[in-house]
C-alpha cells in the first residue's frame, strides 16, 4: 500500500494545510468584528487520490465507489481533522468583548 | 440567511445522505469479509452552496473565501457529520470473527 | 463481552399469552447487520426458529406460528421482546434468545424454561 | 421449507479418534450453513459460519465442509469435553431452519 502522506501527484498537490491570507471584509465579518483586521486562514485544500490520508473506512470506501462509479460518486474531499482555537474581538451593543472559536482555523487535514 | 436546510440548486442536488448499493467486491473487501455480501452503503454526496448545512465557522470562511478566490480555494465540501456502526464477519487466520466498524456508513450530512 | 438474558413468567395456563424479554449488553441492535433471533427447544428435543429483528426493524417469523407471533425491540434499552398468543402444552419449553449477525447465531443467552399447564 | 436433516441422532467414539457429523439441505443453500455445539445443561454455542469457518476462539480440531446439500462437521481428535448435541443450521432463506441434532457419547 502507498504511504498515506507521499502525494502521488507532485508535491503540494494533494490535500494538505494551506494558509490564506484574510481581511476582515473577504471574511464578511467586518461589521460583527473589530480585530483581528487580517487573519492568516489555514484550510485543507488538495486533491484525494487512492490511500492518502484517509481519514476512516468510509473514506476507503468512498474512494473504491468512486473509481467503479465516477459519475455517482465522487472522491473524498480534503477537510479538517481537527481544529485550532482562535479569539476574536466582537462588537457588542455595548463595545466590545472576547469569544473564543473552538471551529474556526483547520489544524491538519486528511480526506473523507 | 436562507434556510439551512432549503436547497436552492432543486430538490436533491444539494449535501444529503444517498445510498449505493455494493457488493464485497466493489468495495475491495472480498479478500477479507465473508459477510455480508452485499451492503447498502450510505454516504454524503451534494453541492455544499452558500449557508447550506454549514458545519462550523470554519466552512462559512470557507464559502467566503471561496466566492472571492474562486481558483485558489474550493466550495465547502459534503461530507458525514456522524456515522452508523456495522457489524463485518471477516476472515482471519483461523476462521471467522466478529468486528464492529463505528466509521463505516455515514449517518447524516453537512458542508466543511 | 456479548451477554443475553430471557426472562418470563415460567408458568402460565393454556390460551394466555406468553411474553418474554431478551436484555442484551455488548452489542447495539442499532449497528447494520445486527439481529436477535428467538429459539425454543422443548426437553430433549431439537432446535425451532420463531422469529428474529433486525437493527432496521425488519422482522421475520416462522411461516407455522406466524399468526401467533409478535417481536419488537427497545434499541435504547437493549431489548427484544416475543410474544407468543395463545399457548398450548406444546409450547413448553426452553426459550432462548441469541444475538443475530447476517443469518448466524453467534451469542446466545441461558435460556428461560416455560412451562405451559391447566 | 428447507429441511435440515441430521441421519444419525447418536454416534459413539473414543477419545483421540475422529468422528464426522453430517447434515443434508433438502435444496440447495450454497455455503449458507452454521454449526452449533450445545453441551448437556447448556445453551447453544456458535462452531462453524459459512460451512467451513470456525468462529474465533473454537480449537482447531473442529472443521467444517460441504456446500450446496451435503455438510460435514469433524471433530479430529475428540476429547471429553466434545460430549456434546451437534446442530446445523441454513441462513440461506426464510424460516431459517436447524438439523435435528446428533448427540456425541464419548465410550
Known amino acids: 500500500a502507498r504511504n498515506g502522506d507521499r502525494c502521488p501527484l507532485g508535491p503540494g498537490r494533494c490535500c494538505r494545510l494551506h494558509t490564506v491570507h484574510a481581511s476582515l471584509e473577504d471574511l464578511g465579518w467586518a461589521d460583527w468584528v473589530l480585530s483581528p483586521r487580517e487573519v492568516q486562514v489555514t484550510m485543507c485544500i488538495g486533491a484525494c487520490p487512492s490511500q492518502f490520508r484517509e481519514a476512516n473506512m468510509h473514506a476507503q470506501i468512498k474512494m473504491n465507489l468512486h473509481r467503479l462509479k465516477p459519475d455517482t460518486v465522487p472522491a473524498p474531499c480534503c477537510v479538517p481533522a481537527s481544529y485550532n482555537p482562535m479569539v476574536l474581538i466582537q462588537k457588542t451593543d455595548t463595545g466590545v468583548s472576547l469569544q473564543t472559536y473552538d471551529d474556526l482555523l483547520a489544524k491538519d487535514c486528511h480526506c473523507v | 440567511a436562507r434556510n439551512g436546510d432549503r436547497c436552492p440548486l432543486g430538490p436533491g442536488r444539494c449535501c444529503r445522505l444517498h445510498t449505493v448499493h455494493a457488493s464485497l467486491e466493489d468495495l475491495g473487501w472480498a479478500d477479507w469479509v465473508l459477510s455480508p455480501r452485499e451492503v447498502q452503503v450510505t454516504m454524503c454526496i451534494g453541492a455544499c452552496p452558500s449557508q447550506f448545512r454549514e458545519a462550523n465557522m470554519h466552512a462559512q470562511i470557507k464559502m467566503n473565501l471561496h466566492r472571492l478566490k474562486p481558483d485558489t480555494v474550493p466550495a465547502p465540501c459534503c461530507v458525514p457529520a456522524s456515522y452508523n456502526p456495522m457489524v463485518l464477519i471477516q476472515k482471519t487466520d483461523t476462521g471467522v470473527s466478529l468486528q464492529t466498524y463505528d466509521d463505516l456508513l455515514a449517518k447524516d450530512c453537512h458542508c466543511v | 463481552q456479548v451477554t443475553l438474558k430471557e426472562s418470563g413468567p415460567g408458568i402460565l395456563q393454556p390460551s394466555q399469552t406468553l411474553s418474554l424479554t431478551c436484555s442484551f449488553s455488548?452489542?447495539?441492535?442499532?449497528?447494520?447487520?445486527?439481529?436477535v433471533g428467538w429459539i425454543r427447544q422443548p426437553s430433549g428435543k431439537g432446535l425451532e426458529w420463531l422469529a428474529n429483528?433486525?437493527?432496521?426493524?425488519?422482522?421475520y417469523y416462522n411461516s407455522a406460528l406466524k399468526s401467533r407471533l409478535t417481536i419488537s425491540k427497545d434499541t435504547s434499552n437493549n431489548q427484544v421482546f416475543l410474544k407468543i398468543s395463545s399457548v398450548d402444552t406444546a409450547d413448553t419449553a426452553t426459550y432462548y434468545c441469541?444475538?443475530?449477525?447476517?443469518?448466524?447465531?453467534?451469542?446466545w443467552g441461558q435460556g428461560t424454561l416455560v412451562t405451559v399447564s391447566s | 421449507d428447507i429441511v435440515m436433516t441430521q441421519s444419525q441422532k447418536f454416534m459413539s467414539t473414543s477419545v483421540g479418534d475422529r468422528v464426522s457429523v453430517t447434515c443434508k439441505a433438502s435444496?440447495?443453500?450454497?455455503?449458507?450453513v452454521a454449526w452449533y455445539q450445545q453441551k448437556p445443561g447448556q445453551s447453544p454455542k456458535a462452531l462453524i459460519y459459512s460451512a467451513s469457518y470456525r468462529y474465533s476462539g473454537v480449537p482447531d480440531r473442529f472443521t467444517g465442509s460441504g456446500s450446496g446439500t451435503d455438510f460435514t462437521l469433524t471433530i479430529s481428535n475428540v476429547q471429553s469435553e466434545d460430549l456434546a448435541e451437534y446442530f446445523c443450521q441454513q441462513y440461506n432463506s426464510y424460516p431459517l431452519t436447524f438439523g435435528g441434532g446428533t448427540k456425541l457419547e464419548i465410550k
Open positions: 441469541a444475538q443475530e449477525v447476517y443469518g448466524w447465531f453467534a451469542y
Open positions: 429483528i433486525w437493527w432496521n426493524d425488519d422482522k
Open positions: 455488548g452489542f447495539s441492535l442499532s449497528t447494520y447487520g445486527m439481529g
Open positions: 435444496q440447495n443453500v450454497g455455503t449458507n
